[in-house]
């Protein structure tokens, strides 16, 4: 059973079969004798009741208003009324793109990760019994698939799979041939699964400083969007008015991960800032990674091996 048309605003392409199904349908079957009315209003036109004589293209059923096919002048507001129940739809019929097998404004976009399962199934449950055949096109070129009733693609995605896939259903009604097109814009992206976040550079950094001067300690990491990067220092963070955490900067990598950096600024360096650990940590659901900075007076730098020294 096809679900009812609950969305209040609908856009459709001219020249295709289309239907509106009201949302009290089960109720309508229980009350066969109840008067059911469909109305249309557009522009200055007040609510005009629709009937089979309104247009040869319009068919009225208990639950459904059908268009064979829908045309540009069908744009407007449609109402269904039965007993205590009233429903309204605003229908916008747009021009078909005559230079393509699909109309850009009627495309559903989907993002698929490379190597992940990718599926396109051409189905149309409402018109199923009337469909003669269905074709699947990629970028308007017909794909040769075994099943011409419900063509399907099922595979692990590759970058070459990116493109516009159009399911075109061909059906007959009252001796006329119609088609219904449903198009998907498939974008293939890099694997977006989480990485283990990592801090860049050595785990322990000795920084040569001069008393009374300022220093900026830069902590950089490669991480996931939801991961956090923070500084820990002293017994109570924030107890030293000369220490400031700057705003975190983030740049997205081409792979969809994040490069983050957070600077700890120490102003007017004093003795109390020397030889203590300033720890930078990146934390995620998968665990943490920490690197440490130690400020060392320049005069004492001869005592430190060169390979652990940063400026």
């Amino acid at each position: 059973a096809e679900s009812c048309t609950s969305r209040p605003h609908i856009t459709v392409v001219e020249g295709e079969p289309f239907y509106l199904k009201h949302c009290s349908c089960s109720l309508a079957h229980e009350i066969e004798t109840t008067t059911k009315s469909w109305y249309k209003s557009s522009g200055s036109q007040e609510h005009v009741e629709l009937n089979p004589r309104s247009s040869s293209r319009i068919a009225l059923h208990d639950c459904v208003l059908e268009f064979w096919p829908v045309e540009l002048n069908d744009t407007g507001s449609y109402f269904f009324q039965m007993k205590n129940y009233t429903q309204k739809w605003k229908l916008n019929v747009i021009r078909r793109n005559k230079h393509s097998c699909f109309t850009e404004r009627q495309v559903t976009s989907k993002i698929v990760e490379v190597k992940k399962f990718f599926q396109i199934t051409c189905e149309n449950s409402y018109y199923q019994t009337l469909v003669n055949s269905t074709s699947l096109y990629k970028n308007c070129k017909k794909l040769l698939l075994e099943n011409n009733k419900n063509p399907t693609i099922k595979k692990n995605a590759e970058f070459e799979d990116q493109g516009y896939y159009s399911c075109v259903h061909f059906l007959h009604h009252n001796g006329k041939l119609f088609n219904i097109t449903k198009t998907f814009n498939i974008t293939i992206v890099e694997d977006r699964s989480n990485i283990v976040p990592v801090l860049l550079g050595p785990k322990l950094n000795h920084v040569a400083v001069e008393l009374g001067k300022n220093v900026r300690l830069n902590c950089s990491a490669l991480l996931n969007e939801e991961d956090v990067i923070y500084w820990m220092f002293g017994e109570e963070n924030g107890s030293d008015p000369n220490i400031h955490e700057e705003k975190e900067m983030r740049i997205m990598t081409p792979e969809g991960k994040w490069h983050a950096s957070k600077v700890l600024r120490i102003e007017n360096i004093g003795e109390s800032n020397l030889n203590v650990l300033y720890n930078c940590t990146v934390a995620s659901t998968g665990g943490t990674d920490t690197k440490s900075f130690i400020l060392v007076r320049k005069a004492d730098m001869a005592d430190i091996p060169g390979h652990v020294f940063t400026r």
Partner: nanobody, 122 residues
Framework: EVQLVESGGGLVQPGGSLRLSCAAS????????MGWFRQAPGKEREGVAS???????YYADSVKGRFTISRDNSKNTLYLQMNSLRAEDTAVYYC????????????????WGQGTLVTVSS
Amino acid sequence: EVQLVESGGGLVQPGGSLRLSCAASGTAYDNACMGWFRQAPGKEREGVASIHLRDRTYYADSVKGRFTISRDNSKNTLYLQMNSLRAEDTAVYYCASSNICNALNLQGNTYWGQGTLVTVSS
């Protein structure tokens, strides 16, 4: 932008009358139905009256015969005429508009106003 703006609330004595207005933008006004709802302190919001396409009207049992819902299409405005007011009518009154309506139940994409306070007290 869809907007519903109520006005006309205030303090009134028991037995008195008030007329609430709801000015609506086009999309909200030309809907399947519009209605008045109310919420008394500590209670759930309840339907008071609704008017459907072709001016079909529905009322809560507690207001039948006392309240009248109407609209003026030239002004895109919904009204609620409240007569013989009682203390139990005290509430914030909301105007609403929906694309799916079943008597007083709004079941679809529903727009709400900010509400206007009606106090019935001596």
